[in-house]
């Protein structure tokens, strides 16, 4: 509520706005009859410098002129860009207890003259839009700077708008509020931007343009697609555009894709036929427009149209495999398995599969539809059987895939040789083989099939298989391969009407088993001891067991035990040993060995042979 300048005045020379690097003189003068009441000679004027309302300096030592008790002049230098506040105060030196009294203050602004505006760019959005121009102002002036945008054109057309920049707002764009119409398409227009502040002024170079240079069409709207005869691959894309548009760019892609299909369409008039779409696929479509074939700018992309193409009948062939087992004296169970079509082959939602089993000579046919990817039937063991499967969606069915039902491992001469299985990493196994040595018919293909060596349901846990061309002798199997599980792998060689196979076990990663086999019984027969055991539970095997070891030593002996190593066969659960002395008590135990090492020992059993050993 105090009038700060009641006691005196503050003036600045040469001006309150100065260029960067300049000095200024600030004079502080007391009004008549103002000052320290009793002793005018004790009047002391001080000048304080504030930046952002913070006192940064007392300019006591910068006095250049002093009329004692009346006025003082201070020189200020090295002022930083922007605004600095100076406050003059009166200090009555005889009264130490009273704080200095404000006399008056002044703001000095330090800045630079504006640079000529550059890179002027003008646009008019749509045929009915208005012209707006933007520019680069150059270096910040730190002063209030006025900008004037002037447009001139044919028929004495002139127009101008103004705006200013300061420390709160930036002016580098102005909308002139006028519309250029297409009938001025060939006319030339000139714009210039002038910048003025307290330290100077500058003008841009004139910027010349035509209607076509600056008008950006509005993006197309109301996009839709019509599929001809509900086709999944052909559709007509339609949209609305501004009247003057002569060129469109279309882009479209499946939603999970990373690259667009691009199409240029001239004089499309809001319609374009697409012929290479993928059926039953989610697509995204966008369109952009241009007013002139060679000049002008493209509009922004339209909003996306997202839609799914209709279904078409499936294409491609199903990958079929089978398993057959004799289930009584004159019947066999055929379990057919097939892999789902990939989306580009299914071309729609697969509703069911049509399965046919046919006995070729007697013309017996079993037919069924199923929604599963397997089908099981009991048929006579006699006759030559063939199976076919096709996939159906709402538009139709794929061509049936045929397979001859042969005895897959029936022909020894067709058995592949030197089958090996090597772990490649945690989740795959490399299987290699050599072709059959004396095949009496040509190998049409190899099938590599694998199953976990764990109890499983025949239908719930279908086989995994790979089809391999006849000139390939290796396969990398990875589907459903888990570490620490042993797989039985079969390589089938198939001719037109026969099959031969070879088996091997393999794992992708192994550890030593958790435990050894459990000895269940020791029996003596014909001067030999038979050791019987139960196998290690599957989860504890931790890979393929290569062999078992039976250890024995005399009870209480500190000698190393003897051992017998036997090849692992799941079907074997007993083994004879014949090097034990009669009427000597022995301790026996077993271990299991994988490629990673030996298990801890299983249970110990004591036994004292009675008969004559050896």
């Amino acid at each position: 509520n105090i009038d700060v300048c009641k006691l005196g005045t503050v003036t600045v020379q040469p001006a309150p706005v100065i260029p960067l690097g300049s000095a200024a003189n600030i004079s502080c003068s007391l009004n008549p009859k103002q000052g320290c009441s009793h002793y005018p000679s004790s009047n002391e004027l001080i000048l304080l410098k504030f930046v952002n309302d913070v006192l940064v300096e007392n300019l006591h030592g910068k006095k250049v002129h002093d009329h004692t008790g009346h006025s003082s002049t201070f020189q200020v230098t090295n002022l930083s860009l922007g605004m600095t506040l100076f406050v003059c105060k009166l200090n009555c030196s005889n009264s130490q207890k009273k704080p200095p009294v404000p006399v008056c203050g002044v703001e000095i602004s330090v800045g630079v003259a504006p640079e000529p505006p550059q890179n002027i760019s003008c646009v008019q959005e749509g045929e009915n839009g208005t012209v707006a121009c933007s520019w680069n102002s150059g270096k910040v002036t730190y002063l209030k700077t006025n900008y004037t945008l002037q447009l001139s054109g044919p028929n004495n057309l002139t127009c101008q708008k103004q705006c200013f920049s300061d420390n709160r707002q930036n002016c580098n764009r102005l909308d002139l509020g006028i519309n250029l119409s297409p009938d001025l398409a060939e006319s030339r227009f000139i714009v210039r931007v002038t910048a003025i502040n307290d330290l100077g002024n500058s003008s841009s170079l004139p910027h010349t343009f035509t209607f076509l240079d600056i008008v950006i069409p509005l993006p197309p709207w109301d996009i839709r697609i019509n599929f001809l005869n509900a086709s999944g691959s052909r559709g007509t894309l339609q949209w609305e555009d501004e009247g003057q548009v002569v060129l469109n760019q279309l882009r479209y892609q499946p939603l999970n894709s990373t690259s667009w299909n691009m199409v240029n369409a001239t004089n499309a008039k809001g319609k374009y036929d697409l012929r290479d779409l993928r059926p039953f696929t989610e697509y995204e479509f966008q369109i952009s427009s241009k007013l002139h074939l060679s000049g002008g700018s493209w509009s922004n992309w339209s909003e996306s149209l997202r839609t799914r193409t209709p279904e078409e009948e499936p294409v491609g062939i199903l990958d079929i495999w089978y398993m057959k087992q004799d289930i009584d004296y004159d019947r066999q169970q055929i379990s057919l398995f097939w892999k789902s079509l990939n989306p580009s082959e299914a071309r729609g939602k697969i509703l069911h599969y049509q399965v046919t089993l046919q006995e070729v000579t007697k013309k017996t046919t079993l037919q069924n539809t199923t929604r599963h990817t397997s089908w099981t039937r009991v048929i006579p063991r006699t006759g030559a059987w063939t199976a076919s499967v096709s996939a159906a969606n709402s538009k139709g069915a794929s061509a049936p895939t045929h397979i001859n039902i042969v005895d897959l491992c029936g022909t020894g001469l067709l058995a592949p040789h030197q089958v090996s299985a090597k772990s490649e990493n945690m989740d795959n196994i490399l299987v290699t083989w050599q072709p059959p040595k004396k095949a009496d018919s040509a190998v049409r293909e190899y099938i590599v099939e694998w199953r976990a060596l764990q109890p499983g349901s025949i239908t719930k846990f279908p086989p995994h298989w790979l089809r391999i061309p006849p000139d390939n002798m290796s396969a990398l199997i990875s589907e459903n391969i888990k570490p620490y599980i042993c797989y039985e792998i079969r390589v089938h060689a198939l001719s037109e009407s026969q099959g031969g196979c070879s088996s091997i076990r393999g794992d992708s990663k192994h550890k030593a088993p958790v435990s050894g086999p459990h000895i269940t019984a020791i029996t003596e027969k014909k001067e030999r001891l038979f050791i019987s055991w139960t196998h290690i539970p599957f989860p504890e095997q931790r890979g393929c067991i290569l062999h078992y070891r039976i250890y024995w030593k005399e009870r209480d002996s500190t000698a190393q035990p003897e051992l017998c190593e036997i090849q692992y066969r799941r079907s074997q659960n007993s083994h004879p040993i014949s090097s034990l002395q009669p009427r000597v008590t022995y301790v026996l135990w077993m271990t299991a060995v994988t490629a990673a090492g030996e298990s801890p020992q299983g249970n110990e059993r004591e036994f004292c042979p009675q008969g004559k050993a050896n």
Partner: nanobody, 119 residues
Framework: QVQLQESGGGLVQAGGSLRLSCAAS????????MYWYRQAPGKQREFVAY???????NYLDSVNGRFTISRDNAKNSVYLQMNSLKPEDTAVYYC?????????????WGQGTQVTVSS
């Protein structure tokens, strides 16, 4: 190991019905494919019906339409409903479970239950 126990057999007149039951116990976590077989005196054992994990069923031609196989997973049981019985259906009926380990098929059998159809 898997244990199977059949029940429900007996003497019935031609045209009558019986319902056989088979209860499974033991290591049955991987048993999904269940079968009924029968063996008539002086003949070989023959397949009658099976039911898969996905409840797909298949029958011997001569019993198709008269016999129905079903299962109750909660009770670990499989059933054979036999209607319009004929004297030639007389046999010991066996429950069978198959599971696969690698490519080897392990089979488990029950003790059998006698079905006699009188004319």
């Amino acid at each position: 190991q898997v244990q199977l126990q059949e029940s429900g057999g007996g003497l019935v007149q031609a045209g009558g019905s019986l319902r056989l039951s088979c209860a499974a116990s033991g290591s049955i976590f991987a048993i999904d494919d269940m079968y009924w077989y029968r063996q008539a005196p002086g003949k070989q054992r023959e397949f009658v019906a099976y039911i898969t994990a996905t409840n797909s069923a298949n029958y011997l031609d001569s019993v198709n339409g008269r016999f129905t196989i079903s299962r109750d997973n909660a009770k670990n049981s499989v059933y054979l409903q036999m209607n319009s019985l004929k004297p030639e259906d007389t046999a010991v009926y066996y429950c069978n479970a198959k599971q696969i380990v690698g490519f080897q098929i392990d089979e488990y059998w029950g003790q059998g239950t006698q079905v006699t159809v009188s004319s």
